[in-house]
């Protein structure tokens, strides 16, 4: 069992895979979010909407993802666990102005393999 | 199962793979999350809405993904275990305005191999 | 500096066909959502259609629903709307616009179609 | 489909003097903390140019002259102190939903 006390917990395993959460503000309604492996671009969504307020989601790169309107999730299923690797979320923000780009927080995460189980250290 | 007394869980384990959690704002409509391992983009994803209100997804590479309207879960499924690594997830906001940019809270995963079990430890 | 550069527009019978391109440079054109405004000589503007960024979505207004088709070509930076069925209302000089997230927030100069026999 | 509205249809206000112009939407353009509602300038020969959106935010190289206020179904558009180069017609337009429509336009010019 994996306790914490932090307001946000970027890692969570599910069905054998990583689901790792990159948070931005409530306040964002057009935006591009991507994740990275160390300097890999791993997925990548971005929120954009038309000039009748229709949304419009591109994830390029088809990874698994869950969008909340604080949140963007990409679940990656079969990490590779040969080493352990800093994972981190960038964030662009297209609306509300002005732009701005940053990179978030992010996690080392390290898969130790075996039959049974994995387990994960997850320092913050 | 894995619980803790955050709010949100960044990583969950799913058939193997790992699950991150990139959580973000309800109020947010249009956006990018992007997962970082380290400095390495592993995922990317973007939701953007047209003038009818159609949401357009781009994941541009391609990861297992989950959207709600307040986080994108990525699936990892073959993290790479040999050594700990600090994922976090990157979130441009572009509706509502100004856009914004920044990188999510995140969290170092490491897997330990075995033949019986994964086991995750989660330091928040 | 955002060049939008529209062109197609000439004189066509009621019922004929035309097809208009707006040439867009200075950004990131797969980056944005892209629109068609019209407006008709000593009159207001009227939306007409737009697309997302890849070619996936597109929406029309009720004027031109069906006789209309918007496409773009990121390859090119190029976008088109070829237009079908053209009527006497159709007479209008067409804008090609870059929605910015939040407006309009780039035009072409216009180019003019005029419906008439 | 959200009509909007614009009065008056034209003014002519003094040099430095204000103008005020006002946009009423058929619903609530509000949606969460936005507004879904930008104004336009379109000057004689000219294609239009994006002044205000979300109701009360500049574009970007706009003159602080200009301010935008309003919520819900009422909004205005001010200019404090009307400059020669600012005799245009001015479009209030809705993001809403679609289709987006524009108001009907208001003429300024000078007294």
């Known amino acids: 069992e994996i306790n914490g006390s932090a307001d946000h917990r970027m890692f969570s395993f599910h069905n054998g895979g990583v689901q790792i959460s990159c948070k931005y503000p409530e306040t964002v309604q057009q935006l591009k979010m991507r994740l990275f492996r160390e300097r890999e671009v791993l997925c990548e969504l971005t929120k954009t909407k038309g000039s009748g307020n229709a949304v419009s989601i591109k994830n390029p790169m088809l990874c698994l993802y869950h969008l909340s309107n604080n949140s963007v999730s990409f679940f990656l299923n079969n990490p590779d666990s040969s080493q352990g690797s800093y994972y981190f979320c960038s964030l662009s923000i297209f609306d509300p102005p002005p732009f701005q780009e940053r990179n978030l927080s992010g996690g080392y995460l390290h898969i130790y393999e075996s039959q049974l189980c994995c387990q994960l250290k997850l320092w913050l | 199962e894995i619980n803790g007394s955050a709010d949100h869980r960044m990583f969950s384990f799913h058939n193997g793979g790992v699950q991150i959690s990139c959580k973000y704002p309800e109020t947010v409509q249009q956006l990018k999350m992007r997962l970082f391992r380290e400095r390495e983009v592993l995922c990317e994803l973007t939701k953007t809405k047209g003038s009818g209100n159609a949401v357009s997804i781009k994941n541009p590479m391609l990861c297992l993904y989950h959207l709600s309207n307040n986080s994108v879960s990525f699936f990892l499924n073959n993290p790479d275990s040999s050594q700990g690594s600090y994922y976090f997830c990157s979130l441009s906001i572009f509706d509502p305005p100004p856009f914004q940019e920044r990188n999510l809270s995140g969290g170092y995963l490491h897997i330990y191999e075995s033949q019986l079990c994964c086991q995750l430890k989660l330091w928040l | 500096e955002v060049q939008l550069v529209e062109s197609g527009g000439g004189l066509v019978q009621p019922g004929g066909s035309l097809r208009l391109s707006c040439a867009a440079s200075?950004?990131?054109?797969?980056?944005?959502?892209m629109d068609w405004v019209r407006q008709a000589p000593g009159k207001g503007l009227v939306w007409v259609s737009n697309?997302?960024?890849?070619?996936?979505?597109?929406e029309y207004s009720p004027f031109v629903k069906g006789r209309f088709t918007i496409s773009r070509d990121n390859a090119k930076n190029t976008l088109y709307l070829q237009m079908n069925s053209l009527r006497a209302e159709d007479t209008a000089v067409y804008y090609c616009?870059?929605?910015?997230?939040?407006?309009?927030?780039?035009w072409g100069q216009g180019t003019l179609v005029t419906v008439s026999s | 489909d959200i009509v909007m509205t614009q009065s008056p249809d034209s003014l002519a206000v003094s040099l430095g003097e204000r103008a005020t112009i006002n946009c009423k939407s058929s619903?609530?353009?509000?949606?969460?903390?936005?507004?879904?509602l930008t104004w336009y300038q379109q000057k004689p020969g000219q294609p239009p140019k994006l002044l205000i959106f979300?109701?009360?935010t500049r574009h970007t190289g706009v003159p602080d002259r200009f301010s935008g206020s309003g919520s819900g179904t009422d909004f205005t558009l001010t200019i404090s102190s009307l400059q020669a180069e600012d005799v245009a017609v001015y479009y209030c337009?809705?993001?809403?939903?679609?289709?987006?429509?524009f108001g009907p336009g208001t003429k300024v010019d000078i007294k």
């Open positions: 616009t870059r929605w910015g997230r939040f407006g309009f927030d780039s």
């Open positions: 200075g950004f990131t054109f797969s980056d944005y959502w």
């Open positions: 697309i997302d960024e890849d070619g996936s979505i597109t």
């Open positions: 619903q609530s353009l509000l949606s969460g903390s936005f507004n879904y």
């Open positions: 979300y109701a009360s």
């Open positions: 337009h809705h993001h809403y939903n679609a289709p987006p429509t």
